[in-house]
Interface confidence: low
């Protein structure tokens, strides 16, 4: 079966900078990554970035670095001030769209004993939703 | 080679909506975001906001937000992009352009255009 | 918003002439930049891509260069048909448009 894994780090630099790191454990062919906070995208979540292998990338305010790291993994930096920051407590989540597993999405947040900058390893988080 | 064709001109009364469509064809639709553009009589351009029709997902300039909706439909390649509480400021030509890119990377342009939708509002 | 800034908002020019069009970004915007032709009437076309990459069926003639927030659209011997209203535009966060640069026949 298919896993989303997802680890979230918070910058030691900058405190309202984080680094959200997503990747998916398959064999199928990637055709879209969208990565969201506050919850699943469309379950109230809002989104950051969207990837497509071909297409390119789009992301939007805070996120100000969206990159693909491999063909099945990805990662965001996100840089917030205000009312546009992200919190220690604050979800995000990755969705993969690969062919032909279909959607898989899992979430994930800061470690709550977390110290700025560091992180464990990434470990596959529980797939919340396979459409 | 893709085309875009928009909707005919409009004429609207202040406070109304318009919704103006624009058609792809000759490629593929739902892998390339839709954009929307104005162009008030002798001004520039301004972005308004876009969508990728697969997996619909839309974003808007913050000055458009909340009187803006660009939708897609994937079924018959077409984008739509409604606005609403019209004023006489909103007396423009609107086009659609879609949003191609290199891969891997977050280079974007607007590449074709449509032919571009006249909007009048008075009233 | 990142904001762009165009200069000159006009200019006058012959035939021949050498051509330089400057844009700004208020903030680095890398590459992330496109220029585009308007003549009256019609839709916007796009010439370069990327700061610096030709658009395909585009004359050599245009070319772009910058990066971070300075760049420039040079047209290296105008052409009749050049003259026309440039526009440049930044795709790294969202989108923004320059004001324009209309390039007439002096």
């Known amino acids: 079966t298919p896993e989303v894994w997802v680890q979230v780090r918070m910058e030691a630099t900058e405190l309202s900078s984080f680094t959200i790191r997503c990747g998916f454990l398959g064999s199928g062919s990637i055709s879209l990554v969208t990565v969201s906070w506050g919850g699943p995208n469309g379950a109230g979540g809002t989104t950051l970035a969207v990837l497509h292998p071909e297409r390119g990338i789009r992301q939007w305010a805070p996120a100000r670095q969206a990159r693909w790291e491999t063909q099945s993994s990805i990662s965001l930096i996100l840089e917030g001030s205000g009312a546009s920051s992200p919190c220690a407590n604050t979800t995000f989540c990755c969705k993969f769209a690969s062919f032909p597993e279909g959607s898989w999405e899992a979430c994930g947040s800061l470690p709550p004993s977390s110290d700025p900058g560091l992180s464990a390893p990434p470990t596959p988080a529980p797939i919340l939703r396979a459409d | 080679q893709v085309q875009l064709v928009q909707s005919g001109a409009e004429v609207k009364k202040p406070g109304s909506s318009v919704k103006v469509s624009c058609k792809a064809s000759?490629?593929?639709?739902?892998?390339?975001?839709i954009s929307w553009v104005r162009q008030a009589p002798g001004q520039g351009l301004e972005w308004m906001g876009g969508?990728?029709?697969?997996?619909?997902?839309?974003n808007y300039a913050q000055k458009f937000q909340g009187r803006v909706t660009i939708t897609a439909d994937e079924s018959t390649s077409t984008a739509y992009m409604e606005l609403s509480s019209l004023r006489s400021e909103d007396t423009a030509v609107y086009y659609c352009?879609?949003?191609?890119?290199?891969?891997?990377?977050?280079?974007?342009?607007?590449?074709?255009w449509g032919q571009g939708t006249l909007v009048t509002v008075s009233s | 918003d990142i904001q762009m800034t165009q200069s000159p908002s006009s200019l006058s020019a012959s035939v021949g002439d050498r051509v330089t069009i400057t844009c700004r970004a208020s903030q680095s915007i890398s590459s992330y930049l496109n220029w585009y032709q308007q003549k009256p009437g019609k839709a916007p076309k796009l010439l370069i891509y990327?700061?610096?990459s030709l658009q395909s069926g585009v004359p050599s003639r245009f070319s772009g260069s910058g990066s971070g927030t300075d760049f420039t659209l040079t047209i290296s011997s105008l052409q009749p048909e050049d003259f026309a209203t440039y526009y440049c535009?930044?795709?790294?966060?969202?989108?923004?448009f320059g004001g324009g640069t209309k390039v007439e026949i002096k």
């Open positions: 352009a879609r949003d191609t890119g290199r891969g891997y990377t977050r280079h974007f342009w607007f590449d074709p």
């Open positions: 000759g490629g593929t639709f739902g892998n390339y975001a």
């Open positions: 990327a700061a610096s």
């Open positions: 535009q930044q795709s790294d966060i969202l989108y923004t």
């Open positions: 969508i990728i029709p697969i997996p619909g997902i839309a």
